[in-house]
């Protein structure tokens, strides 16, 4: 099979996920202490191998009397972290992944890092504000991301298959033009990551490019091919 | 670096024939579309056809099936594109491209006149 | 065939604007395109291949987008130096179509 001719572009359509951290300027805000500050839960998908930095409710430190970390991954004990201001005492359990660290010592603040972020830091993590006033939550169920591996190929006569390896969540494949397509196949990996591959046929000699566009929370990649001639076509007139 | 030379410039008779050139260079050429383009003078862009020198292979625009006639010597890498019966219409740039159109020669300007 | 409807077919814009330029397949047929620049006497430069992609070499101020069948070439800041025809092409369909051109004037 000659490699006929593969362009790539990488579309300009990126979800904006370089800023990893929702932890806004709330902690310089005065908060009444609300019941809507109760009990927060945040669905955050968040790019492998950046940086997170995960963050408390806005207490003031001077009402606080506990800050502790819950982290519940996937096929591990729940980890916790805390920190007792009263006796500037900071203790783990349960916690042997080095990259989810303090941001710095709690008692300068309060947030929760993941340095780099891994397939594996997929789950829920939960910050427990224990005040005079009662407990405060904020909880993350965070979504690692995978960016899939792009391929694009013509594997026999006008047909061609286009896979997006290795994704998390699963990619979207669709075509221009549209062609005669098989089912979408997916195939699961133990790491929680999906390859998804289609394969399409173009009947019409008119069309001379197609283009596997692949739509992912990490953001949007197409490729183009060139269709080699079917063989024996010699000369047409269009 | 894929690189198509062009000839500058081509002047011929009307009703005489033109045997323009391409030489290619940087990638396999047999495995890529070669496309030829005509610009007349402060005009838009048209397309003549394709060859695949892989195959010999052929598609024409219908305006051109009976004007140009595409050609490939694959041992000099070089695609060629013959325009016959020449009239003042055919006083134009014409440019081969390849890559699925992201590498074009410098094209090569036919004037004709007598 | 395709028809590429690219337009305005001119424009005028001071240096420093945000300038763009629309093509479209005709009956709204979904294509791929690239986008070229052209200076008089010389050949077309490719300055966004396969819709988005902007070309090693050009300038960041350029970019290209789709919306639906509809293509889009900005410049976000008008320079000097791109006074020229631009025009699409789609490379989707036999034949290959060009847009009309958009011819770009500094005020």
């Known amino acids: 099979q000659s490699n006929n001719s593969l362009m790539l572009q990488t579309s300009k359509e990126n979800h904006t996920l370089a800023s990893n951290s929702l932890c806004m300027d709330e902690k310089q805000i005065t908060q009444n202490h609300s019941k809507v500050l109760a009990e927060v839960n945040i669905s955050w998908p968040v790019q492998m191998a950046r940086n997170a930095v995960l963050c408390c409710p806005p207490i003031e430190f001077r009402n606080l009397i506990v800050i502790t970390w819950e982290i519940i991954l996937r096929g591990q004990p729940s980890c916790t972290k805390s920190y007792r201001k009263e006796t500037n005492e900071t203790k783990e359990t349960n916690c042997t992944d080095e990259r989810i660290t303090w941001v710095s010592t709690p008692d300068q603040n309060s947030d929760l890092q993941i340095h780099p972020v891994a397939i594996t830091h997929d789950g829920y993590y939960r910050c427990i504000m224990a005040t005079p006033d009662g407990n405060f939550h904020r909880g993350y169920h965070l979504q690692v991301l995978v960016t899939p591996e792009v391929t694009l190929f013509e594997s026999r006569n006008r047909t061609a298959v286009c896979k997006a390896v290795a994704g998390k969540p699963a990619a979207q494949i669709s075509w221009i033009p549209a062609g005669d397509c098989a089912p979408t196949e997916q195939e699961y990996w133990g790491n929680g990551t999906v390859t998804v591959k289609s394969t399409c046929h173009w009947e019409g000699h008119n069309v001379s490019t197609v283009t596997c566009h692949v739509s992912h929370l990490t953001g949007n990649k197409s490729l183009y091919i060139e269709l080699l001639p079917v063989p024996g076509a010699k000369k047409s007139a269009k | 670096q894929v690189q198509l030379q062009q000839p500058g410039s081509e002047l011929v008779r009307p009703g005489a024939s033109v045997k323009l050139s391409c030489k290619a260079s940087?990638?396999?050429?047999?495995?890529?579309?070669m496309h030829w383009v005509k610009q007349r003078p402060g005009q838009g862009l048209e397309w003549i056809g394709n060859?695949?020198?892989?195959?010999?292979?052929?598609n024409y625009d219908e305006k051109f099936k009976s004007k140009a006639k595409l050609t490939v010597d694959t041992s000099s890498r070089t695609a060629y594109m013959q325009l016959s019966s020449l009239t003042s219409e055919d006083s134009a740039v014409y440019y081969c491209?390849?890559?699925?159109?992201?590498?074009w020669g410098q094209g090569t300007l036919v004037t004709v006149s007598a | 065939d395709v028809q590429m409807i690219q337009s305005p077919s001119s424009l005028s814009a001071s240096l420093g604007d945000i300038v763009t330029m629309t093509c479209q397949a005709s009956?709204?047929?979904?294509?791929?395109l690239h986008w070229f620049q052209q200076k008089p006497g010389k050949a077309p430069k490719l300055l966004i291949s396969?819709?988005?992609n902007l070309e090693d070499g050009v300038p960041s101020r350029f970019s290209g987008s789709r919306y639906g069948t509809a293509f889009t070439l900005t410049i976000s800041s008008l320079e000097d130096e791109d006074m020229a025809t631009y025009f699409c092409?789609?490379?989707?369909?036999?034949?290959?179509?060009f847009g009309g051109g958009t011819k770009l004037e500094i005020k």
């Open positions: 491209l390849t890559m699925t159109g992201t590498s």
């Open positions: 940087g990638h396999t050429f047999t495995s890529y579309w």
């Open positions: 060859i695949y020198p892989g195959s010999g292979s052929i």
């Open positions: 009956q709204g047929t979904p294509i791929n």
């Open positions: 396969g819709a988005s």
């Open positions: 092409l789609q490379f989707t369909y036999i034949p290959w179509t």
